[in-house]
C-alpha cells in the first residue's frame, strides 16, 4: 500500500516516502527504489535555511553600500546574510533592503527614542513643563527651568518649543 | 521502455584523451540523472561520476581531476571526457539511469595502446 | 570511499546446489531515513550486469524466488536455493547509500 503521508523530514513523491535535504543543501534527485534522496551542498554565497526539496539554493543578501547598507552578519550555507544600516541610518522595511538617514525631531518634540540600524527616531510632543528647541535626532524634551529654586520669577511662561525665562523678583517699594 | 546506448572511439593512444557519448531513450534527461560506471578486463566494476538532472556534477576522488562529464538535454545525450589515458584506462565503459539501475547499456569498449 | 569485499572469489556448485556469497562494508550502509541501499547483480559471460536484488532482500523483477539477498548494517548475504545452469557467472554487490558508489570485487559462480 503506497503511502499518502511521510514522517517529518520527508516529502511524498511517486507514491514514495523520500528524505528532505538538511539546511545548506539543495535536491540534485528524488529517491528511488534504488536510491536514497541525493543532496549536494550549497555554493559559495549560497543558502538553504530549512529542510527542503529545493533544486536550487538561494543567493546570499547583498548589503549594497550605495544603498547605506553593511552586513551585519556574514551568510553561511544555512543562514542568509543580514544587512544593516551605516551610522545614522536605518532600514526602511524589517527586510532592511535600503536606508534612510534618521528622523530628527522638530522644535516642539523631543526623542522619545533613538533610531538603531533598524528602527526610526521615535518623537514625542513636549509635555506642558517641557521644551525643545531644536530639531535633533538626539535630544529630549527638557524641563522648563524653575525660577522658584533660583529665587527668580517667571518673566515669560515657557512653550513647548521655549523655556521660561526668569527674572528677578519685584522688590516691595 | 528505457535505453542507453554508449558509442566511443574504441582505440585511444596512451596519454590522449577519451570522448564517449551516452545516447538515451525512454526517460528524459531534464528529470533524471545519469552515472558512467566502467569494467576493466575480467575486473569488478567501478563508478566513475554522475551528471544530475540540474547538470550538477559529483566524480569519483581518484579520477576527478582528469575527469569530466556534460550533456545535451535537446539531444538527450550525456558525454564522458577523460585525459591523459594510461593503460589501466582500458575497460568497458558504461552509461546509466538513475534510478534505472535494472538497465544498463551494452557499454562501449576502450582500449589504450600505442 | 565505502569498500565492498566480496567471498569467495569463486564458487564452485553442482548444478541443484545451494550457493552462497558473502559482501561486507567498511562501514555501516543504513542511511539516515532507515534504509540500506545495498544491490546484487549477476554478469553472464559476454553481458552487461542484470540487477537481482535491491535494498537488502527487494528481488527485482522478473527474477526468480530461488535468489534470496538478506543481512544488516555491513553483513550481507545472497543465496541461491538450488543453482540452475543459466545463473552461472559473476556475481556483485553494490551500494549506493553513500557517494562514491562503490560495488564489491565480484564473486565467480561456476561448475565444479
Known amino acids: 500500500e503506497p503511502p499518502t503521508a511521510c514522517r517529518e523530514k520527508q516529502y511524498l513523491i511517486n507514491s514514495q516516502c523520500c528524505s528532505l535535504c538538511q539546511p545548506g543543501q539543495k535536491l540534485v534527485s528524488d529517491c528511488t527504489e534504488f536510491t536514497e534522496t541525493e543532496c549536494l551542498p550549497c555554493g559559495e554565497s549560497e543558502f538553504l535555511d530549512t529542510w527542503n526539496r529545493e533544486t536550487h539554493c538561494h543567493q546570499h543578501k547583498y548589503c549594497d553600500p550605495n544603498l547605506g547598507l553593511r552586513v551585519q552578519q556574514k551568510g553561511t550555507s544555512e543562514t542568509d546574510t543580514i544587512c544593516t544600516c551605516e551610522e545614522g541610518w536605518h532600514c526602511t522595511s524589517e527586510a532592511c533592503e535600503s536606508c534612510v538617514l534618521h528622523r530628527s525631531c522638530s522644535p516642539g518634540f523631543g526623542v522619545k527614542q533613538i533610531a538603531t540600524g533598524v528602527s526610526d527616531t521615535i518623537c514625542e510632543p513636549c509635555p506642558v513643563g517641557f521644551f525643545s528647541n531644536v530639531s535633533s535626532a538626539f535630544e529630549k524634551c527638557h524641563p522648563w527651568t524653575s525660577c522658584e529654586t533660583k529665587d527668580l520669577v517667571v518673566q515669560q511662561a515657557g512653550t513647548n518649543k521655549t523655556d521660561v525665562v526668569c527674572g528677578p523678583q519685584d522688590r516691595l517699594r | 521502455q528505457v535505453q542507453l546506448k554508449e558509442s566511443g572511439p574504441g582505440l585511444v593512444a596512451p596519454s590522449q584523451s577519451l570522448s564517449i557519448t551516452c545516447t538515451v531513450s525512454?526517460?528524459?534527461?531534464?528529470?533524471?540523472?545519469v552515472h558512467w560506471v566502467r569494467q576493466p578486463p575480467g575486473k569488478g566494476l567501478e563508478w566513475l561520476g554522475v551528471?544530475?538532472?540540474?547538470?550538477?556534477?559529483n566524480y569519483n576522488s581518484a579520477l576527478m581531476s582528469r575527469l569530466s562529464i556534460s550533456k545535451d538535454n535537446s539531444k538527450s545525450q550525456v558525454f564522458l571526457k577523460m585525459n591523459s589515458l594510461q593503460k589501466d584506462d582500458t575497460a568497458i565503459y558504461y552509461c546509466?539511469?538513475?534510478?534505472?539501475?535494472?538497465?544498463w547499456g551494452a557499454g562501449t569498449t576502450v582500449t589504450v595502446s600505442s | 570511499d565505502v569498500v565492498m569485499t566480496q567471498t569467495p572469489l569463486s564458487l564452485p556448485v553442482s548444478l541443484g546446489d545451494q550457493a552462497s556469497i558473502s559482501c561486507r562494508s567498511s562501514?555501516?550502509?543504513?542511511?539516515?531515513?532507515?534504509?540500506?541501499?545495498l544491490q546484487w547483480y549477476l554478469q553472464k559471460p559476454g553481458q552487461s550486469p542484470g540487477l537481482l536484488i535491491y535494498?537488502?532482500?527487494n528481488r527485482f523483477s522478473g527474477v526468480p524466488d530461488r535468489f534470496s539477498g538478506s543481512g544488516s548494517g555491513t553483513d550481507f548475504t545472497l543465496k541461491i536455493s538450488r543453482v540452475e545452469a543459466e545463473d552461472l557467472g559473476v556475481y556483485f554487490c553494490?551500494?549506493?547509500?553513500?557517494?562514491?558508489?562503490?560495488f564489491g570485487g565480484g564473486t565467480k559462480l561456476e561448475i565444479k
Open positions: 546509466l539511469g538513475h534510478g534505472h539501475f535494472d538497465v
Open positions: 525512454g526517460f528524459s534527461l531534464p528529470t533524471s540523472g
Open positions: 551528471i544530475w538532472a540540474g547538470g550538477d556534477t
Open positions: 562501514q555501516s550502509l543504513v542511511h539516515s531515513s532507515g534504509n540500506t541501499y
Open positions: 535494498k537488502v532482500s
Open positions: 553494490s551500494q549506493t547509500t553513500h557517494v562514491p558508489w562503490t
